[in-house]
């Protein structure tokens, strides 16, 4: 008796965070034996879509020509082979940006900060929101969530960083969202460039602290430190 069919791989191109109106392609890759691919969307009647395999039959393409709120959500795919259905893939979370107006991102006391000191990034929205996200460009794990307790809505969230090192330098944006759909985000804030200069005692960053390439500290989640950032908001890392 053969074991269960290997689960397929699910991914999105150009990525899983898509601006409203832009196109996105979801790919499901199974095996050469696949006869049919199905895509399930959480809380939708299954299957959300089905496709015949593309030659050489080991994957299928699910096209979304124009991203809207309806497409945002959590997906899994699976395939049928001559011996039955595969296990479902790991989930893909498709997020749409542009659902709400853009927040403002600023740095306190300044976007120019000395290594070893503290800085707080402040994300402010015009209307009350209950989730704020901070994203650092080119980070493998870019999302930092601040979600309000008990559904209380806030106009802003603070992301404190202490002590700052050269790794914290870079370009940031923030988003705001409502808790009823974590897959719908605001337009991105304008970018904020955080510039970290060397301390007086250490004018040149050591090699281990320098701005890294692909496999270095940039690939680690940005973890804020310090006290709870804002009354009613709690830190939530995903």
């Amino acid at each position: 008796q053969a074991g269960p069919l290997p689960k397929p791989t699910l991914w999105a191109e150009p990525g899983s965070v898509i601006s409203w109106g832009n196109s996105v392609t979801i790919w499901c890759q199974g095996t050469l034996e696949a006869r049919e691919y199905r895509l399930d969307k959480e809380e939708s009647p299954a299957p959300w879509d089905r496709q015949n395999p593309l030659e050489p039959k080991n994957k299928a393409r699910f096209s979304i020509p124009s991203m809207t709120e309806d497409y945002a959500g959590r997906y899994r795919c699976y395939y049928r082979s001559p011996v039955g259905w595969s296990q479902p893939s790991d989930p893909l979370e498709l997020v749409m940006t542009g659902a709400y107006s853009k927040p403002t991102l600023s740095a306190l006391p300044s976007p120019l900060v000395t290594s070893g000191k503290s800085v707080t990034l402040l994300c402010q929205s015009r209307s009350p929101m209950d989730t704020f996200l901070l994203i650092k460009e080119r980070a493998a794990h870019p999302l930092l969530h601040l979600r309000s307790e008990h559904g209380a809505q806030q106009h802003q969230a603070e992301f404190p960083m202490s002590p700052v090192t050269s790794v914290h330098g870079g370009t940031y944006r923030c988003f705001s969202s409502h808790g009823f759909s974590h897959y719908l985000l605001s337009h991105p804030s304008d970018p904020l460039e955080l510039i970290v200069s060397g301390s007086l005692e250490d004018p040149r960053p050591s090699p281990t602290r320098s701005v890294s390439t692909a496999a270095g500290p940039e690939d680690q989640p940005l973890m804020p430190t310090g006290s709870v950032p804002h009354s009613g908001l709690r830190r939530h890392w995903e």
Partner: antibody, heavy 120, light 106 residues
Framework: EVQLKESGAELVKPGASVKLSCKAS????????MHWVKQRPGQGLEWIGE????????NYNEKFTSKATLTVDQSSSTAYMQLSSLTSEDSAVYYC?????????????WGQGTALTVSS | DIVMTQSPSSLSASLGGKVTITCKAS??????IAWYQHKPGKGPRLLIH???TLQPGIPSRFSGSGSGRDYSFSISNLEPEDIATYFC????????FGGGTKLEIK
């Protein structure tokens, strides 16, 4: 009881368009894909395409991509197929058929068919 | 596309007798074949799926068998209401139908 009731026979002129309907009852309309099948006189059946009533996603037989357009109206549990630029080759009986997801079988219930005649 | 060759195109049999219809696929269809009964003015009725699985409510007089490329469908103890056209459908890869068999009673 699952039922698929299709619209009545149509006589249309070449070059025109026609919209056939298929009203579903006896089950949750949005939980099953709806397929359309063509049968020309004295010939076999051909699969045209399918639509997911819950979100409007469609898949077509390549042969029919520029001929047929599938839509649904959730409020009336009705599926539609519009056929455009009609020629005598489109004269046929068209069936709607419900997809069965649990057994993989594409069609477990069918409508009675709509006869389309294209003639000047 | 997979081609399904169904035979015979028509046949005549006696009440109480048995008939067998075959469908041959142009390639292995891994038992993904269904059989339907079609009467004039009505929609086709699903009798059997996955080669031999009888649909609920279908009498056991109907049966199916086969594997690989070769499949058969039989009706035993023929009754008057069995007069119809029968066709196969493969759903292993895309969807293609057999040409149909018209059954008449002698």
């Amino acid at each position: 009881e699952v039922q698929l009731k299709e619209s009545g026979a149509e006589l249309v002129k070449p070059g025109a368009s026609v919209k056939l309907s298929c009203k579903a009852s006896g089950y949750t309309f949005t939980s099953h894909w709806m397929h359309w099948v063509k049968q020309r006189p004295g010939q076999g059946l051909e699969w045209i395409g399918e639509i997911n009533p819950s979100n409007g996603r469609t898949n077509y037989n390549e042969k029919f991509t520029s001929k047929a357009t599938l839509t649904v109206d959730q409020s009336s549990s009705t599926a539609y197929m519009q056929l455009s630029s009609l020629t005598s080759e489109d004269s046929a009986v068209y069936y709607c058929a419900r997809g069965n997801l649990t057994t993989v079988v594409p069609f477990d219930y069918w409508g009675q068919g709509t006869a389309l005649t294209v003639s000047s | 596309d997979i081609v399904m060759t169904q035979s015979p195109s028509s046949l005549s049999a006696s009440l109480g007798g048995k008939v067998t219809i075959t469908c041959k696929a142009s390639q292995d269809i891994n038992k993904f074949i269904a059989w339907y009964q079609h009467k004039p003015g009505k929609g086709p009725r699903l009798l059997i799926h996955f080669t031999s699985t009888l649909q609920p409510g279908i009498p056991s007089r109907f049966s199916g068998s086969g594997s690989g490329r070769d499949y058969s469908f039989s009706i035993s103890n023929l009754e008057p209401e069995d007069i119809a056209t029968y066709f196969c459908l493969q759903y292993d890869l895309l969807l293609t139908f057999g040409g149909g068999t018209k059954l008449e009673i002698k």
